[in-house]
Amino acid sequence: MSKGEELFTGVVPILVELDGDVNGHKFSVSGEGEGDATYGKLTLKFICTTGKLPVPWPTLVTTFSYGVQCFSRYPDHMKQHDFFKSAMPEGYVQERTIFFKDDGNYKTRAEVKFEGDTLVNRIELKGIDFKEDGNILGHKLEYNYNSHNVYIMADKQKNGIKVNFKIRHNIEDGSVQLADHYQQNTPIGDGPVLLPDNHYLSTQSALSKDPNEKRDHMVLLEFVTAAGITHGMDELYK
């Protein structure tokens, strides 16, 4: 068990803060909830603190919850591949470039670390080149979320990881908006981190609303499990 992994044995409170600017539309989002890495479970509620969110909530899911991949469930035989927990409590910088097919792109930078007993994800987001009547600024996405696989590889040069995945957003007309994600994670601290073999995270997300919440918001339930590395031969002969 890495030193960082010991911090995730129980339920951990989560705080998310985002400052965004998409095509000049500025906004802020605050999120609160909790994570339980034993089950790879996240429950979070996000509120746009600046009024109406200028982009559809589903386009921010990866920035919020795929931001705290330290809550992913890594099975026992894969724990030595869990970069995310090993970087704690100092945390990691997580950066992404996200291209929305035939539309604009997001660039994000987040610092994910413990502040006291709380896991905090502080994010800056910049969106450019979006069409005002496109699927994103035109709010044509359905309020739901598909399951995805998130592919992880070591980046020894940066003492971190590179990640790639393609998100499929459902559009109201029945078609799909693709979003290509390019991600890099680097540790904030100088301590040793686990550099993984290639593997993936399997994610399932459910979006809902709080019937008592008047502000523009999103409620998110997510399960994330690491996979893609089989038991070694030594496991077979135990």
């Epitope: 600017d21 950066e95 992404r96 470039t97 291209f99 792109n105 660039k107 930078r109 800056e124 910049k126 450019i128 080149d129 590889m153 940066k158 590179k162 790639n164 393609k166 290509d180 390019y182 991600q183 890099q184």
Partner: antibody
């Protein structure tokens, strides 16, 4: 050893076309972004276009959008810049450069450059 | 587009001098700023990335810092091989470069 080698530059008339190539060695372009940056004679650096070959995601400077197309062939580990409807103001040395996947990476390796001259 | 206003456009200095070049972004660019050195007829070379991270193999006399939307490249003790043109570059929006600063021998 990481290397980027540009080719395809030359003299072309206004309205004409050229295709620049950027052959990469010593690394797999799929796991990086590739950028074209140009420098007009005696002037500063100007970004032209970028491609993320893993998913073929692209972006362009406003000055070339609709005229230039960036592409990549991962099997050949090569990026391309197709330049159409060339103008006199496109005259420059064109460099290809490698960067990481994210905004803070910086362009850590550059080619030697290839000169494009647009003149009648 | 995000503008990077670089100053000064040129400066004269002597070997051993401390040299400071600044870039101001027209809006927030997070830490997505890099600095390059270019010599005549050559391709640019990366010095600093992520506003303040020294690129591998670059001498430690080069450093970068950020204060909001102001970014600074400092050469603590100018060496003969440092006379060149320096550019800042942001990649938070569509990529843009500063106009360049030519460092000449006094």
């Amino acid at each position: 050893e990481v290397q980027l080698v540009e080719s395809g530059g030359g003299l072309v008339q206004p309205g004409g076309s050229l295709r620049l190539s950027c052959a990469a060695s010593g690394f797999n372009i799929s796991y990086y972004s590739i950028h074209w940056v140009r420098q007009a004679p005696g002037k500063g650096l100007e970004w032209v276009a970028s491609i993320y070959p893993y998913y073929s995601s692209t972006s362009y400077a406003d000055s070339v959008k609709g005229r230039f197309t960036i592409s990549a062939d991962t099997s050949k580990n090569t990026a391309y810049l197709q330049m159409n409807s060339l103008r006199a103001e496109d005259t420059a040395v064109y460099y290809c450069a490698r960067a990481g996947w994210v905004a803070s990476s910086g362009m850590d390796y550059w080619g030697q450059g290839t000169l494009v001259t647009v003149s009648s | 587009d995000i503008q990077m206003t670089q100053s000064p456009s040129s400066l004269s200095a002597s070997v051993g001098d401390r040299v400071t070049i600044t870039c101001r972004a027209s809006q927030s660019v997070s830490s997505a700023v890099a600095w390059y050195q270019q010599k005549p007829g050559k391709a640019p070379k990366l010095l600093i990335y992520s506003a303040s991270s020294l690129y591998s193999g670059v001498p430690s006399r080069f450093s970068g810092s950020r204060s909001g939307t102001d970014f600074t490249l400092t050469i603590s003790s100018l060496q003969p091989e440092d006379f060149a043109t320096y550019y800042c570059q942001q990649s938070w929006g569509l990529i843009t470069f500063g106009q360049g600063t030519k460092v000449e021998i006094k």
